[in-house]
């Protein structure tokens, strides 16, 4: 017997559906109506035939009461080829729900998204996460998707994007967006970051994550942030192959005084990079290749410093003199 495609936990909190059959019984998903967290994985299916079975242009208000009754707050949809029209239909219906967090992963969106009808209401998400989502519309995808969302989005995460740069002139400002995560876009680079950080479209950013994004130097990132007018409080540059030295011909970049937390862990650094902010609350340099202790002008003033997992601290990799101190903690790097 084939396993049930959907599983609801005992608390009716989390429901996960894996539709791997070529002709799945989508009605199985109805057992998820009581769940708060719902995950639907479509096994890479093309949902084009769905368009024939549903009226994507139907007025979603007829479903409003039913949708409002749903408990779902977090929804993940993955592994499918989805016509843009179908996605829009789903967003229009979900606009009446209490959904707060939407994750789309391993999706191929085909066709163009129609504009938001005047009478339609946007989806009031606080968090939108996209991983490996491709859009037929290329660089304008964010602007097209944005019009279907209310302006209160707080968290936006875009990983493994096929086009991490956006058509900035079409994108409206995200006035409430405090966290932007562009991690796991190894082809982004510092030039791509400048293109992705549409100037003045992200005025409220506090947390910016750029893990594994092909960044080269902290100074280059500083320049991209300055150009975009983005002033995060927290910046994560971990898991990039960073160079410690700055090109002498490159102009010196002044970090925003708002920045108080910088993560440079797992960055392959052999020395503390030049051109860091003068003062930080948190600096994470763990799991790098620092083979000697920093001298006083090589570190900014930091309240909370993490250096664990560097060769100069790991017993056996260097000969510490009598009385030298290491943390005694050797993390798995």
């Amino acid at each position: 017997t084939t396993p049930e495609p959907c599983e609801l936990d005992d608390e009716d909190f989390r429901c996960v559906c894996n539709f791997s059959e070529p002709q799945p019984d989508w009605s199985e998903a109805f057992q998820c109506v009581s769940a708060v967290e719902v995950e639907i994985h479509a096994g890479g299916l093309n949902l084009e035939p769905f368009l024939k079975r549903v009226d994507a242009d139907a007025d979603p208000r007829q479903y409003a009461d039913t949708v409002k009754a749903l408990r779902v707050r977090r929804l993940t949809v993955g592994a499918a080829q989805v016509p843009a029209q179908l996605l829009v239909g789903a967003l229009r219906v979900l606009a009446y729900s209490r959904l707060k967090e939407l994750t789309l992963e391993d999706l191929k969106i085909t066709g163009t998204m129609p504009p938001l009808p005047l009478e339609a209401t946007g989806l009031a998400l606080s968090s939108l996460r996209l991983r490996n989502v491709s859009w037929a519309t290329g660089r304008s995808w964010l602007a097209e998707l944005q019009q279907w969302l209310k302006p209160g989005l707080k968290v936006l995460s875009i990983a493994q994007a096929h086009s991490p740069a956006f058509s900035c002139e079409q994108v409206r400002a995200f006035p409430a967006l405090t966290s932007l995560d562009l991690s796991d876009n190894p082809g982004l680079g510092e030039r791509g970051l400048m293109a992705a950080l549409c100037p003045h479209k992200f005025p409220a950013i506090q947390n910016l994550a750029l893990r594994n994004t092909g960044m080269e130097t902290p100074t280059g990132v500083c320049a991209a942030l300055a150009a975009a007018g983005v002033q995060p409080h927290s910046l994560d540059l971990s898991h990039n192959s960073l160079r410690a030295t700055v090109n002498p011909s490159a102009p010196r970049c002044m970090w925003s005084s708002a920045l108080n937390s910088l993560n440079l862990s797992f960055a392959g650094l052999e020395q503390v990079p030049k051109g860091l902010p003068a003062k930080l609350r948190v600096l994470d340099l763990s799991c790098n290749r620092l083979n000697r202790a920093p001298q006083p002008d090589e570190l900014p003033e930091v309240d909370n410093l993490t250096l664990d997992g560097n060769p100069f601290l790991v017993p056996g990799t260097a000969l510490p003199h009598e009385g030298s101190m290491n943390s005694g903690v050797v993390p798995a790097c």
Epitope: R292, A293, P294, Q295, P296, D297, E298, L299, E301, V302, N304, L305, T306, L307, L313, H321, G323, S324, M325, N326, S327, G328, V329
Partner: antibody, heavy 125, light 108 residues
Framework: QIQLVQSGPELKKPGESVKISCKAS????????MNWVKQAPGNGLKWMGW????????TYADDFKQRFVFSLETSASTAYLQINNLNIEDTATYFC??????????????????WGPGTSVTVSS | DIVMTQSPTSISISVGERVTMNCKAS??????VDWYQQKTGQSPKLLIY???NRYTGVPDRFTGSGSGTDFTFTISNMQAVDLAVYYC??????????FGGGTKLELK
């Protein structure tokens, strides 16, 4: 073992210059910053500043920004303190001392773990 | 610059007694205070770093405590060999670093 050996005592006239050496052995010279500390007769210790032994960049305390020069001869694992245009108030013992980095679960800093024996400089007309 | 005020300037003490001296920073220095011992005609020696950590080879009769602006250095069982001048130094994470004026230990 780790040692800092300083040059011998100096007797100078006002207006002259003096250059004191501090030769390090027993450790990798360029891994630790070198500091200079002044002690006038009967007085306490006064931190003069330090030099980054990787880059050669000196940092001077406010009272020592004018006539004082820190330098290195890395190949000889030696740090130097030069005082120009000497005056009576420069009469003191000058110590070199290595600053060692300390780190333990988020807390860090430097302390002076090895000191040279001091070089006495007397300025008298 | 941060000013380190040490008190008292001198203490008369007998062998075997407990001796305590203080150091006050003009602003918060966290736990960034070290204590050094200087005997007549010698260079200073590190005893305590980061307010309370005893340096390698330093006898356990020497202890340090405090944080913020107030720091204390104690010799629990005074020995004749401990006669010296003791200096506190603030080693806040970025220079300039400053020493206190010193406390001289003398025999009663």
């Amino acid at each position: 073992q780790i040692q800092l050996v300083q040059s011998g005592p100096e007797l100078k006239k006002p207006g002259e210059s003096v250059k004191i050496s501090c030769k390090a052995s027993g450790y990798t010279f360029t891994d630790y910053a070198m500091n200079w500390v002044k002690q006038a007769p009967g007085n306490g210790l006064k931190w003069m500043g330090w030099i980054n032994t990787q880059t050669g960049k000196p940092t001077y305390a406010d009272d020592f920004k004018q006539r004082f020069v820190f330098s290195l001869e890395t190949s000889a694992s030696t740090a130097y303190l030069q005082i120009n245009n000497l005056n009576i108030e420069d009469t003191a013992t000058y110590f070199c001392t290595r600053s060692t980095f300390y780190y333990s679960s988020y807390i860090y800093g430097w302390y002076f773990d090895f000191w040279g024996p001091g070089t006495s400089v007397t300025v008298s007309s | 610059d941060i000013v380190m005020t040490q008190s008292p300037t001198s203490i008369s003490i007998s062998v075997g007694e407990r001796v305590t001296m203080n150091c006050k920073a003009s602003q918060n220095v966290g736990s960034n205070v070290d204590w050094y011992q200087q005997k007549t005609g010698q260079s200073p020696k590190l005893l305590i770093y980061k307010a309370s950590n005893r340096y390698t080879g330093v006898p356990d009769r020497f202890t340090g405590s405090g944080s913020g602006t107030d720091f204390t250095f104690t010799i629990s069982n005074m020995q004749a060999v401990d006669l010296a001048v003791y200096y506190c130094m603030q080693s806040n994470t970025n220079p300039p670093w400053t020493f206190g004026g010193g406390t001289k230990l003398e025999l009663k």
